[in-house]
């Protein structure tokens, strides 16, 4: 007796974080013994979609020509061989920006910061929203949330960082979402550089503190430290 | 029971258009995806596409892309088919079907066809 | 695509006898056959799907059996309802059907 059918592999072209409008595709990759694909979304009617797989029958694609809402959440694929249907796939959580307007990016007391120091980035929305999200470009594990507790809704959400080092450096942009979907965000924030300059005493950042390569510390995930950011909101890592 | 009920026959003129239509009752409609199914007299059956009538997804047999055209109206239970620049080869009987996700068949519900005849 | 080529296009048989219809597949369809009976003025009727399961409500007198390219249909001890047209559909890879075998009683 054979063992259970490989899991697929679930991804999505260009990526899973996707602007109102653009188009997405997402692919679903199993073997070629593959008869048959079929993508499932969280809280639909199974399938939501299927495909006939695509010579040499080893994946499938499932076109979205324009994001919307509708598209926006959590999907798993699976496949149909010769002898019965493949495991699911991992969760693929499609995420759809422009959902609400964008909210705005500082840092206090600024943008430039001895390495060393502190600094704290304010994401503030003009309408009240329950979770924030900080982004830092080209990090492998980009999303930190500050969820506000008890469904309490709030402007602005404190992300500290202390001590500030030389990885810390880089492109930041925030974005604001209501807790009844997550999958939907606003317009991302317009962008923040943080420079982070020598300490007195350390002028030049040693090699293990420079800005890194692919696979360094910018891989790493970004973890506020200090006390809790914001009154009514709690740290929430994903 | 699961009933599906299609629209009267039709005369149409060539390169005219014509909207068909199937009224799903006795489950739930956005449950199973809805097949359309194409039989020339004389001939075999051929399929021509499927719908979800959840989020209207559509997959097509490529002979059909620019031919037909599947919608649906969720509040009705009704699924369409339009078929466009008609000609006397689409002169047929066109059957909508219900897809039966749990034992992977299409088809387990038919409806009893529409005869279309395509004359000047 | 996956041709089906269904026999024979027509036949005529007793009351309470038994026909055979066969579908041989193009390629290997891994028992992924259904057969449909149809009348005139009705939508067609699931009998069997994957090449032997009988569907809910069909007569045990219907059967279907068959592997790789090869795949049968029987019907015994004919009734007069049994008249009527019957088909084969392959869900393996794509959809493709048989010609249709048009059952008359003698």
């Known amino acids: 007796q054979a063992g259970p059918l490989p899991k697929p592999t679930l991804w999505a072209e260009p990526g899973s974080v996707i602007s109102w409008g653009n188009s997405v595709t997402i692919w679903c990759q199993g073997t070629l013994e593959a008869r048959e694909y079929r993508l499932d979304k969280e809280e639909s009617p199974a399938p939501w979609d299927r495909q006939n797989p695509l010579e040499p029958k080893n994946k499938a694609r499932f076109s979205i020509p324009s994001m919307t809402e509708d598209y926006a959440g959590r999907y798993r694929c699976y496949y149909r061989s010769p002898v019965g249907w493949s495991q699911p796939s991992d969760p693929l959580e499609l995420v759809m920006t422009g959902a609400y307007s964008k909210p705005t990016l500082s840092a206090l007391p600024s943008p430039l910061v001895t390495s060393g120091k502190s600094v704290t980035l304010l994401c503030q929305s003009r309408s009240p929203m329950d979770t924030f999200l900080l982004i830092k470009e080209r990090a492998a594990h980009p999303l930190l949330h500050l969820r506000s507790e008890h469904g309490a809704q709030q402007h602005q959400a404190e992300f500290p960082m202390s001590p500030v080092t030389s990885v810390h450096g880089g492109t930041y942009r925030c974005f604001s979402s209501h807790g009844f979907s997550h999958y939907l965000l606003s317009h991302p924030s317009d962008p923040l550089e943080l420079i982070v300059s020598g300490s007195l005493e350390d002028p030049r950042p040693s090699p293990t503190r420079s800005v890194s390569t692919a696979a360094g510390p910018e891989d790493q995930p970004l973890m506020p430290t200090g006390s809790v950011p914001h009154s009514g909101l709690r740290r929430h890592w994903e | 029971e699961v009933q599906l009920k299609e629209s009267g026959a039709e005369l149409v003129k060539p390169g005219a258009s014509v909207k068909l239509s199937c009224k799903a009752s006795g489950y739930t409609f956005t449950s199973h995806w809805m097949h359309w199914v194409k039989q020339r007299p004389g001939q075999g059956l051929e399929w021509i596409g499927e719908?979800?009538?959840?989020?209207?997804?559509?997959n097509y047999n490529e002979k059909f892309t620019s031919k037909a055209t599947l919608t649906v109206d969720q509040s009705s239970s009704t699924a369409y088919m339009q078929l466009s620049s008609l000609t006397s080869e689409d002169s047929a009987v066109y059957y909508c079907?219900?897809?039966?996700?749990?034992?992977?068949?299409?088809?387990?519900?038919w409806g009893q066809g529409t005869a279309l005849t395509v004359s000047s | 695509d996956i041709v089906m080529t269904q026999s024979p296009s027509s036949l005529s048989a007793s009351l309470g006898g038994k026909v055979t219809i066969t579908c041989k597949a193009s390629q290997d369809i891994n028992k992924f056959i259904a057969w449909y009976q149809h009348k005139p003025g009705k939508g067609p009727r699931l009998l069997i799907h994957f090449t032997s399961t009988l569907q809910p409500g069909i007569p045990s007198r219907f059967s279907g059996s068959g592997s790789g390219r090869d795949y049968s249909f029987s019907i015994s001890n004919l009734e007069p309802e049994d008249i009527a047209t019957y088909f084969c559909l392959q869900y393996d890879l794509l959809l493709t059907f048989g010609g249709g075998t048009k059952l008359e009683i003698k």
């Open positions: 719908i979800n009538p959840s989020n209207g997804r559509t």
């Open positions: 079907a219900r897809g039966n996700l749990t034992t992977v068949v299409p088809f387990d519900y």
